[in-house]
């Protein structure tokens, strides 16, 4: 029921002239702007009998007539002070004022809420002239009312600089409840308790809550809004939604879906990026997260080599970018990989398990016994080296590239040689007379050029000199020999 | 020291089912591969197949694919060989490795007679 | 499947000589080839994995070479006690095959 404090009329003159709702029927609108048609009656309370002037601003005027008698002060009439409305309805209602035709342009504005409404609202102004007084009717309509209409509508007048305004119209916008809050979707723990909020508003007020789990009501007698679902913990998921009532019907939310978090699936799809001799770069796909955000992600490598020990290694990771690089690996090995991921419940089954290869590596270790000597007869350099032992994961040796620097009066220049693996010797040609050649060799394999061997210096004299001793790779420890022959 | 422990001996009758134990001790049973090999009676040695502890993944000889099924109890650091069906060709003696064939079991004598 | 041919099926030597066993296998195995000792009514030994890297515990008398088809196991100044079949087993993919064994015989 609404109740309406209504205001007690207090009595002034009234002006001269025709007054809304005694018009006389050959009276005609100087001006009529159509209104929207259309509109449907609503419920109007009214403070007082019509035709009183309100008590709201009133404007004094300050110009006497002929006989000097005051004018009555200006004010508009009392007119419907709240409308109660169903949505979707149409509304009409009015302001009048009566202004003496002393006062020329004179416009009427409406505002609601403290703001004024412009544009595109169906507000129309007629104007009633006599003799005296001019009878201005503004009104305002509204096709189709919906909440937003809600609300304090004034007209205000402008004469003199002063500023007159209406009484408020109250529009009340009654329908189904709407909500403003409404339960939202959640991952929660098995058997955990967890709370849902629903709140929704009419007018009509109250507004009164109905929750609903799995199209069955969960309690017997309604809450008033707004209502907490204390839910004491689910074993599977369910849906939950709530029902708004008022006077006017119910309202029913959405629907949330609550899921239990559970362990992820295992990752999918877990491929080879890259591979080198030592590391393997790795991606996979995230299976489900289980309604619970990864944390993070194991690698599980396992040494697939038909005969290999098995050692597993487990790298831990970030749950992103879904990508590793598997690092301190043997060369030319292979090797089964796996990935596991964790939510906060556990972690996943491990995907499938892929085979990965190393690729092959180069050779860890240089060759020994380098030796150097000079032929001088057909003015070659001799250099002789042993094979170097090199370990399976090396891969097969394909050559030996012997680095060989020539260091003469300032001027420094090397030279690259390449040898067949079958090789354990090689004649380089002297390249400068009176200078120092020092030699380096190192293994090569497919996976790349090993480590070079210590440097052996040797002496190329001026032409004439005569050849001796080798020079030989020093022991560890000892300075780089250098032979002058 | 790492061990691995394995019957002496066992006698079935043809067409029954035998399962192969091989205990395993002083080392960590799911760091490494277990591979069994048979060896007939004055001839050379064949690998069965070869099981991992830590996850029960297997890689098996065509050959003895439909023989010999490979399986591990992680709890006692034990591994297990059916074979089914037996015949006299499966007369053997039948030994357990790990990792690289380092460590061998001293070999179970399977006898498959009536 | 890999097939390893050793040779020769028998030797038979004078203890303090210098023996090679040789096996061959049916293609590249990039030096994945293990030799293993079996003495009589004993379990195998390993003795060489990866073609030449010793074993903690075997005499170094014992020494392998050896790349892509082709390798050989030197036993320097054979004792009594090396007596036994020598296999080798070739680990470059599954199934594990071995060799059909060397039998070491001393006079």
């Known amino acids: 029921a609404i109740t309406e404090a209504r205001e007690e009329a207090k009595p002034y003159p009234l002006f001269p002239g025709p007054f809304p709702g005694s018009l006389q029927t050959d009276h005609t609108p100087l001006l009529s702007l159509p209104h929207a048609s259309g509109y449907q009656p609503a419920l109007m309370f009214s403070p007082t009998q019509p035709g009183r002037p309100h008590t709201g601003n009133v404007a004094i005027p300050q110009v006497t007539s002929v006989e000097s008698k005051p004018l009555p002060p200006l004010a508009f009439k009392h007119t419907v002070g709240h409308i109660i409305l169903s949505e979707h309805k149409g509304v009409k209602f009015n302001c009048s004022i009566s202004v003496p035709n002393i006062y020329q342009d004179t416009t009427i504005s409406w505002w609601k809420d403290g703001k004024e409404l412009l544009g595109a609202h169906h507000a129309i102004t007629q104007f009633y002239p006599d003799d005296e007084v001019t009878a201005i009717i503004a009104s305002f309509s509204i096709t189709s009312v919906q909440r937003s209409d809600n609300g304090s509508y004034i007209c205000k007048m402008k004469i003199n600089n002063e500023e007159i305004v209406s009484d408020p119209i109250y529009i009340e916008v009654q329908g189904l409840p709407h909500f403003t809050k409404q339960p939202e979707s959640m991952n929660v723990t098995r058997n955990t308790a967890f709370n849902l909020t629903c709140q929704a508003v009419g007018p009509p007020e109250p507004v009164n809550i109905f929750w609903v789990q799995n199209s069955s009501r969960v309690n017997e007698q309604p809450e008033k809004s707004p209502s907490v679902l204390t839910v004491p913990g689910l074993t599977e998921m369910a849906v939950f939604s709530c029902e708004a009532h008022n006077d006017k019907g119910l309202t029913v939310s959405k629907g949330v879906q609550i899921n239990i978090k559970a362990i992820p699936s295992p990752p999918t799809e877990v491929s080879i990026r890259n591979s080198t001799a030592h590391s393997i770069l790795i991606s996979w796909v995230p299976g489900f997260d289980g309604y619970s955000p990864f944390r993070n992600c194991s690698i599980q490598v396992k040494e697939a080599d038909p005969l290999s020990n098995g050692s597993v290694m487990i790298f831990n990771t970030s749950a992103l970018p879904h990508l590793y690089q598997i690092k301190q690996l043997q060369a030319l090995a292979n090797y089964s990989i796996g990935v596991s991921c964790m939510n906060e419940i556990g972690w996943s089954a491990v995907s499938p398990w892929i085979l990965a290869s190393t690729t092959e590596g180069a050779p860890s270790v240089a060759p020994l016994n380098v030796t150097v000597f000079l032929n001088e007869s057909s003015d070659n350099v001799d250099i002789r080296w042993m094979k170097p032992p090199t370990k399976q994961q090396d891969g097969e040796l394909v050559g030996y590239r012997i680095s060989h620097v020539w260091q003469s009066a300032g001027i420094s220049k090397e030279l690259l040689e390449e040898v067949g693996q079958n090789g354990s010797r090689a004649r380089i040609s002297v390249q400068v007379h009176n200078a120092t050649c020092t030699v380096r060799i190192a293994a090569v394999t497919r996976g790349g050029v090993g480590p070079f061997s210590d440097p052996v210096k040797i002496f190329i004299p001026a032409h004439g000199w005569v050849d001796y001793a080798p020079s030989s790779t020093p022991a560890p420890g000892n300075a780089d020999p250098v032979l002058i022959i | 020291q790492v061990q691995l422990q394995q019957p002496g001996a066992e006698l079935v009758k043809p067409g029954a089912s035998v399962k192969v134990s091989c205990k395993a001790s002083?080392?960590?049973?799911?760091?490494?591969?277990m591979h069994w090999m048979k060896q007939r009676p004055g001839q050379g040695l064949e690998w069965i197949g070869r099981?991992?502890?830590?996850?029960?993944?297997?890689n098996y000889n065509e050959k003895f694919t439909d023989k010999a099924t490979l399986t591990v109890d992680k709890s006692s650091s034990t591994a297990y060989m059916q074979l089914s069906s037996l015949t006299s060709e499966d007369s053997a003696v039948y030994y357990c490795?790990?990792?690289?064939?380092?460590?061998w079991g001293q070999g179970t004598t399977l006898t498959a007679s009536s | 499947d890999i097939l390893l041919t050793q040779s020769p099926a028998t030797l038979s030597v004078t203890p303090g000589e210098t023996v090679s066993l040789s096996c061959r296998a049916s293609?590249?195995?990039?030096?994945?080839l293990h030799w293993f000792q079996q003495r009589s009514h004993r379990s195998p030994r390993l003795l060489i994995k990866?073609?030449?890297d010793s074993i903690s515990g075997i005499p170094s008398r014992f020494t392998g070479s050896g790349s892509g088809t082709d390798y050989t196991l030197s036993i320097n100044s054979v004792k009594p006690e090396d007596e036994a079949i020598y296999y080798c087993?070739?680990?470059?993919?599954?199934?594990?095959?071995f060799g059909a064994g060397t039998k070491l015989e001393l006079k």
């Open positions: 490795a790990i990792g690289t064939l380092i460590y």
């Open positions: 002083g080392y960590t049973f799911t760091n490494y591969w």
């Open positions: 099981i991992h502890p830590f996850d029960s993944d297997t």
């Open positions: 293609q590249s195995i990039y030096k994945k």
């Open positions: 990866f073609a030449s």
């Open positions: 087993l070739q680990g470059y993919s599954t199934p594990l095959t």
